[in-house]
Interface confidence: low
């Protein structure tokens, strides 16, 4: 197999890598590399990530921390978890809103925007599935309402004239 192999580090523990002249111990999560070690198997100089930056993993080479992401207010996102030295901001949607992915194959890192959940009650419909990671799913019309076009219309209360089948209990019509 071609190519050069990095020299093996014969140090106790496995958190050592060749940095410059020597095998050095890496920096823990939340710290960046200020300077490599000055002796074999020594400790690198590591500094804590400044405010609003983070590094999620232990590392041997990052000389600066990553900037924390800002949640996209234009997309109605909110911070579910604030950024720390070891973790990026976790953006999501506030209660009553759900995530609408902006790409077809959605993964956790995909861009998204927040949509308000459908209020089935305001549409006079049953709630079939509550809004969480997907929109509310509304069912058929609530008692006292019937399907008309795309909406639910209040049942007539008079026994005169026609009474839609779903309104039998309201306007007294029976089959």
């Amino acid at each position: 197999q071609g190519g050069t192999r990095s020299p093996r580090c014969d140090c106790a523990g496995d958190f050592h890598k060749k940095i410059g002249l020597f095998c050095c111990r890496g920096c823990p999560a939340g710290h960046y590399l200020k300077a490599p070690c000055t002796e074999p198997c020594g400790n690198s100089t590591c500094l804590v990530c400044p405010q609003d930056t983070f590094l999620a993993w232990e590392n041997h080479h990052n000389s600066e921390c990553a900037r924390c992401q800002a949640c996209d207010e234009q997309a109605s996102q909110v911070a579910l978890e604030n950024c720390s030295a070891v973790a990026d901001t976790r953006c999501g949607c506030k209660p009553g809103w759900f995530v609408e992915c902006q790409v077809s194959q959605c993964v956790s890192s995909s861009p998204f925007y927040c949509q308000p959940c459908l209020d089935c009650g305001a549409l006079h419909r049953h709630t079939r599935l509550l809004c969480s990671r997907r929109d509310t799913d509304c069912g058929t019309c609530l008692p006292g309402f019937y399907e008309h076009g795309d909406g639910c219309v209040s049942c007539p209360t008079s026994t005169l004239g026609s009474c839609p089948e779903r309104c039998a209990a309201v306007c007294g019509w029976r089959q």
Epitope: F98, V99, E100, C101, Q115, H126, R128, L129, R134, D135, D137, G139, T140, E147, H148, G149, D150, G151, E165, R166
Partner: antibody, heavy 121, light 115 residues
């Protein structure tokens, strides 16, 4: 007695179109959401498309989105599936299936006997 | 897309019993599924819906020999006193919404052979 009877299947060439129909009887058609589900020979069930009781909500599987169109005529107790730009992988038995009127749950409680679609050159 | 996993086959002796499993992907462990029976060259038939708490409701004409239960992400269909007409493929299915898109996903089916 609830009945769903599909028709319109047959042999078609790739790129051609077919329209499937499903005629319903024995229940109040306009109260129910409806679905098309297909089954390739010797394979499992694959959901194709959904339409709500008043056509206000329509959804498609990724494999057919942009090529198939689901519609219904509540006055005629009929459900339709317009299939355009057919591909060989659309070869399957196509079933229409009824979603029960409000149960608070998802189910497909009655199925038609199916209509066979074969796409081959 | 949600994932429902079923083993491909199971066998049961006449008058014996068999228990079929449908496993949901972990994030859906509280979702309701539906069991369907499909006899050879026939349309699927609704057997029951089955909630995460084990409560279930059977379709018209489904005998008492069929029952459902749940444990975590697993949904079970049990058939006791198995009869020859139970020889069929059993699918689990689940309706779901993702954003505004409604859909169904099905397991690959378990073929039950009555010996």
């Amino acid at each position: 007695e609830v009945q769903l009877v599909e028709s319109g299947g047959g042999l078609s060439q790739p790129g051609n179109s077919l329209q499937l129909s499903c005629e319903a009887s024995g229940f109040t058609f306009s109260n129910h959401d409806l679905n098309w589900v297909r089954q390739a020979p010797g394979k499992g069930l694959e959901w194709v498309a959904y339409i709500s009781s008043a056509s206000g909500l329509i959804s498609y599987a990724d494999a057919v989105r942009g090529r198939f169109t689901i519609s219904r005529d509540n006055a005629k107790n009929s459900l339709f599936l317009q299939m355009n730009n057919l591909k060989s992988e659309d070869t399957a038995m196509y079933y229409c299936a009824r979603d029960p009127a409000y149960t608070g749950l998802y189910a497909l409680d009655f199925w038609g006997q199916g209509t066979q679609v074969t796409v081959s050159s | 897309q949600p994932v429902l996993t079923q083993s491909p086959s199971a066998s049961a002796s006449l008058s014996g019993s068999v228990k079929l499993t449908c496993t949901l992907s972990s994030e859906l462990s509280n979702f309701t599924i539906v069991w369907y029976q499909q006899r050879p060259d026939k349309a699927p038939k609704y057997v029951m819906y089955l909630k995460s708490d084990g409560s279930h409701s059977k379709g018209d004409g489904i005998p008492d020999r069929f029952s459902g239960s749940s444990s975590g992400a697993h949904r079970y269909l049990s058939i006791s006193n198995v009869q020859s007409e139970d020889d069929a493929t059993y699918f689990c299915g689940m309706g779901y919404t993702l954003a505004n898109q409604y859909g169904w996903v099905f397991g690959s089916g378990t073929k039950v052979t009555v010996l």
